[in-house]
Amino acid sequence: SNQPPGGGGGSGGDCPGGKGKSINCSELNVRESDVRVCDESSCKYGGVCKEDGDGLKCACQFQCHTNYIPVCGSNGDTYQNECFLRRAACKHQKEITVIARGPCYSDNGSGSGEGEEEGSGAEVHRKHSKCGPCKYKAECDEDAENVGCVCNIDCSGYSFNPVCASDGSSYNNPCFVREASCIKQEQIDIRHLGHCTDTDDTSLLGKKDDGLQYRPDVKDASDQREDVYIGNHMPCPENLNGYCIHGKCEFIYSTQKASCRCESGYTGQHCEKTDFSILYVVPSRQKLTHV
């Protein structure tokens, strides 16, 4: 049953907690020789090729939480949260990137058209209007003489944790991969822990892969605390269901306040932010598996 958390029955392609709609890969590949192929080029953005009767289909199986943490997509649409954006990219097999946190409408408020050209997505977000979409955490510097995307990623505080990336280069920390991705404005993924070696297949490394199922899991720094339940922390009461979006809710008895113990890869007061600072991966054959 497609029941969103917190009640209110749902159904359909964007149903919270349900499976995303499947895309028939034969419709995406209009090649006479191999019409039914379902591969990395036809089933991207987190899609998984699955058998469907005679052929294969590209399934988008995203379990998205329903909290309203809106993001503005590069296509001009606002998404309920980042997971909804990723699911849409998979569903439509189009690249959609987050160009701004918050809705896409311009800053002149709600009501009667929201001050944007209806349906065009022309003025997606004022902050990015001159640069075009700045991807991979880059920001638009409109004051600069040569208007462009600038990267303000500071990797100075990260410890030595070398990784091999999809561009064939070794980086001293996953943060530097993000920085390179931001500067080059292209997708660079982490392939494995440790420096790249001669045995690494550079043709494979060079391939861009948006498949979330291969993406390494990440850990929130707060997960390194060795907190033990010593009578001070207890599970939160039922009325705080949903307080922690990606984590466990703990009720601190002494302060009578709730706090969140975030799952791997999330940070923020409600575990609502994605954090890519610390990486833990376990290589399994050629693919990376989540810890």
Epitope: Y68, Y79, F84, E118
Partner: antibody, heavy 123, light 107 residues
């Protein structure tokens, strides 16, 4: 100017059916999720149902689940609410409302609201 | 579901005075809260969204504040046209829920 105009309300017996319509104009209808919100006489507001802009996702309040069906025809810029197995407690003014933000949004504020159509369920 | 509780149920204020309306959520809704005004025989009208952002055309005397579970709508100097019922609504998660309303009446 965004306009929403409801129709289809009226008097119906318990167990009966009604179909409400909401004609929309002044905005790109298919880009916005649309909702029905009701208000019983002298009471507060209650969210009833929401449908995504494309129409492929629908959401219902527990009180109407299994009895009401929300749908839309984007070619006609029209939102519908099919109400079956009506109960006395369904008596209310039914408002059609647009979400404030366009896109793949499933929760939002309502802006603007239609004038409403009165549904009376009585024997 | 998230229960929204408004207080007081009725607020008696003289024109020109300040009115403070409260809305409490049973669990955190971040800043995902809206306020509506409904005058007798009229449809609800959006005043505030995002807990503190005024909607288009709403006078500056209306202001919203708060986040998490405690929210406030303040009308700095009540005008005759402000006497109405005010509702809060959370849109943080399903199902969308409204408060019971606060009626602002002439003292």
């Amino acid at each position: 100017e965004v306009q929403l105009l409801e129709s289809g309300g009226g008097l119906v017996q318990p167990g009966g059916s009604l179909r409400l319509s909401c004609a929309a104009s002044g905005f790109t209808f298919s880009s916005y999720a649309m909702s029905w919100v009701r208000q019983a006489p002298g009471k507060g507001l209650e969210w009833v149902s929401t449908i995504s802009g494309s129409g492929d996702s629908t959401y219902y309040a527990d009180s109407v689940k299994g009895r009401f069906t929300i749908s839309r025809d984007n070619s006609k810029n029209t939102l519908y609410l099919q109400m079956n197995s009506l109960r006395v407690e369904d008596t209310a003014i039914y408002y059609c409302a647009k979400f404030g933000v366009r896109g793949v949004i499933i929760t939002n504020w309502f802006d603007p609201w239609g004038q409403g159509t009165l549904v009376t369920v009585s024997s | 579901e998230i229960v929204m509780t408004q207080s007081p149920a009725t607020l008696s204020v003289s024109p020109g005075e300040r009115a403070t309306l409260s809305c409490r959520a049973s669990q955190s809704v971040s800043s995902n809260l809206a306020w509506y005004q409904q005058k007798p025989g009229q449809v609800p009208r959006l005043l505030i969204y995002g807990a503190s952002t005024r909607a288009t055309g709403i006078p500056a005397r209306f202001s919203g504040s708060g986040s998490g579970t405690e929210f406030t709508l303040t009308i700095s100097s009540l005008q005759s046209e402000d006497f109405a019922v005010y509702y809060c609504q959370q849109y943080n998660n399903w199902p969308l829920t409204f408060g019971g309303g606060t009626k602002v009446e002439i003292k």
